[in-house]
Structures are given as C-alpha cells and as structure tokens.
C-alpha cells in the first residue's frame, strides 16, 4: 500500500517517500522506484538553510554600502549573509535593512547615553553650571571652569554653550 505520510527529512511524491535535499543543496530530480533523490550544491552566491525540495537556491543578501551596511558574517551554502551597520551608524529596523548615522548632540546639549547598534544617541540640555560648545555623539556637558580655584574671578558668565571667562582679581590700590 502506498504511504500517506513520510518520515522526517522525507517528502511524499507520486505515492513514494523521497529524501529531502540537505541544507546547502537544491533538488535536481525526485527519487523514483529505482533512483535516490538527486541534489546539487548551491553556487557560491546562494544558500538553502533547511532540508528542502527547492529547485532553486536563494541568493545571498547584499549588504549595500549606500545604505550604510557592511558584511557582519559572510554567507555559506547553508546560511545567508548577515549585514550590520558601519561604525557610527545604527539599524533603522529590527531586520536591519538600512542604517542611519548616530545623532550628534548640538552645542548646548550633551550626550546622556551613547548610541548602540540598535538605538540612537540620547541628548540632554546642559544644566546651569555646565556647557557644550561642540556638536558630538560622544561629548557630555562639561562643568564651567571654577575661577576661584585658580585665584581668578569670573569676567564673563558661562552659558549652556560657553565656558565662563576667568580674569585676574582687581587689586585695590592703597
């Protein structure tokens, strides 16, 4: 009696159980009563990652440098290429199909948390007593210079974008 179901790593065709092709190989011809399933390895730029009966291998993913992508792991006949973002960029989606540059914090803002491969820079306004005069993805707000510790006085007040300017103390004439 012809089978109605087949074992694992087999498939049913023409009332017969044929072996599936192993990962990295595609189907050329189904088995017959007298011959085993015929499979062929995928070419260098292709892959199949499961036991299968596919007649075509899948093309490896292309990591497009125009989208900020680079190869993280080269594909094999059994695995797809894995792309990742270039340094200074992060993924725009879960599947990481494109990348965007890490945000820079503008003058008056400092970096609260640097970016990761999946999340952007977090910026914060510089509070009173701190400043940032650069646009940066790494720089935190810096404290104003303490003129007193240098035996100087504040000549120009600091802002969130500029440091204080220190100057010599006016010496009173006798």
């Amino acid at each position: 009696e012809p089978p109605t179901a087949c074992r694992e790593k087999q498939y049913l065709i023409n009332s017969q159980c044929c072996s599936l092709c192993q990962p990295g190989q595609k189907l050329v011809s189904d088995c017959t009563e007298f011959t085993e399933t015929e499979c062929l390895p995928c070419s260098e730029s292709e892959f199949l990652d499961t036991w299968n009966r596919e007649t075509r291998c899948h093309q490896h993913k292309y990591c497009d440098p125009n989208l900020g992508l680079q190869v993280q792991q080269k594909g094999t006949s059994e695995t797809d290429t894995i792309c990742t973002c270039e340094e200074g960029l992060h993924c725009t989606s879960e599947s990481c199909e494109s990348c965007v540059p890490h945000r820079s914090c503008l003058p008056g803002f400092g970096v609260k948390q640097i970016a990761t491969g999946v999340s952007d820079t977090i910026c914060e306004p510089c509070p009173v007593g701190f400043f940032s005069n650069v646009s940066s993805a790494f720089e935190k707000c810096r404290p104003w210079t303490s003129c007193e510790t240098k035996d100087l006085v504040v000549q120009q007040a600091g802002t969130n974008k500029t440091d204080v300017v220190c100057g010599p103390q006016d010496r009173q004439r006798a």
């Epitope: 993280q72 792991q73 894995i82 990742t84 340094e87 993924c91 879960e94 990481c96 609260k112 948390q113 640097i114 970016a115 990761t116 491969g117 999946v118 999340s119 977090i122 910026c123 914060e124």
Partner: antibody, heavy 115, light 107 residues
Framework: QVQLVESGGGVVQPGRSLRLSCAAS????????MHWVRQAPGKGLEWVAV????????YYADSVKGRFTISRDNSKNTLYLQMNSLRAEDTAVYYC????????WGQGTLVTVSS | DIQLTQSPSFLSASVGDRVTITCRAS??????LAWYQQKPGKAPKLLIY???TLQSGVPSRFSGSGSGTEFTLTISSLQPEDFATYYC?????????FGGGTKVEIK
Amino acid sequence: QVQLVESGGGVVQPGRSLRLSCAASGFTFSIYGMHWVRQAPGKGLEWVAVISYDGSNKYYADSVKGRFTISRDNSKNTLYLQMNSLRAEDTAVYYCAAGNWFDPWGQGTLVTVSS
Amino acid sequence: DIQLTQSPSFLSASVGDRVTITCRASQGISSYLAWYQQKPGKAPKLLIYAASTLQSGVPSRFSGSGSGTEFTLTISSLQPEDFATYYCQQLNRYPLTFGGGTKVEIK
C-alpha cells in the same frame, strides 16, 4: 533619586492575562527607550521587549511575539507590559530597564503561571 | 540571533584575586557590549558599557576590553562585595541577548 518600580505581578492560570506596570521617577522618562527583561527562577536574563522613547517603535523576543504588548504613557511616566495567553514558561521575575544601556533597572515583580 | 557564550560559568576565587571573565559572540558586535553584576534577590546593575567604558559610580577595579567577537571583564582585586553573578549583553542587533552568566563564589 532615579527609580523604576514594577507592579502587577502575581499568580495567574495558564491562558490568562496580566498587565505589568513600571513607574519611573527622578529622570526624564520621555527621552528614554524602555525595556522589559525577565529571569526565570534560578536561570539567566532574557530580554523580552523594547519601546522607543515616543512609543513609535516596538520590538519583541520571538518567545513572546503575538502574546505580549509593550506600551508607555509619557504623561504618567509609566511603562506597561500586557501579557496574554500566559504559559508556564513565562514564570519569571520581570524587570523594567531604561535607556540604551539598561540603567537603571527596577527591583522586579514576580509572575507565576500555574494551574 | 546572536549567541553570547560566557566562560567560565562558575568561578571560585579569594579576596584580592585578579578575576577575568570572557564573553564570546557568535557574530561580530563591534563594541556594543555591556556587563552587569547581579546579587541574589536583586536587580542587575550596569558595570561596563560600550565594551570598555566604566559606568559612573562603579569602582575602578572593574574594567572591560575587546571588540568584535571576544570580550573580557576583569576585576583587578576581588573584594567581598564582588561575589555575585556577572552577565554580558550584546546591543548590536535585535533580539538583544545575554550571556549565560558567570557565578563568582568565595574559595
């Protein structure tokens, strides 16, 4: 001081639902992406879900996709995790954590799924 | 998914010892790696981020190094309060993943 406090854990039967909350204080909640991480008894850490600072992007671990929903209310400084179709393997302490580099963390809330 | 393999999984050491924990990633993750310390019944605490940057308030005896696929956490001189479990975590791609943990116990 900077603080995250989870609540809403408890004992629930398989197939039922539960909603966890995470109340933030001492920092600007609305600029941070927020995460849920869980830890089964005696086991390691497992990342569960993330939501972007404005709620526009959400990603989930495969083990909870389609069952759990992460959300936030920036006006209330609160993060949520709606857990549906709960399974025994969801039993864990659930932590919320803030920011790109998971700092700070809450103290955790225990969810036990058992019949 | 990116797998993180921590070694050793268990470590017995004495106060004052230099301790090194390794974390290997199954794919390159640049420097997007964090280290956490967890004590029993407590939440994890961030020690190191971006592979080598010490989190504010963390003692300087903790240091991190590495990039790509191989990373290390070093405690230069183990203190009584350092006996805990340590986890690495990659933040390069979703889903974010943690290593299996390294338990540091008193010899």
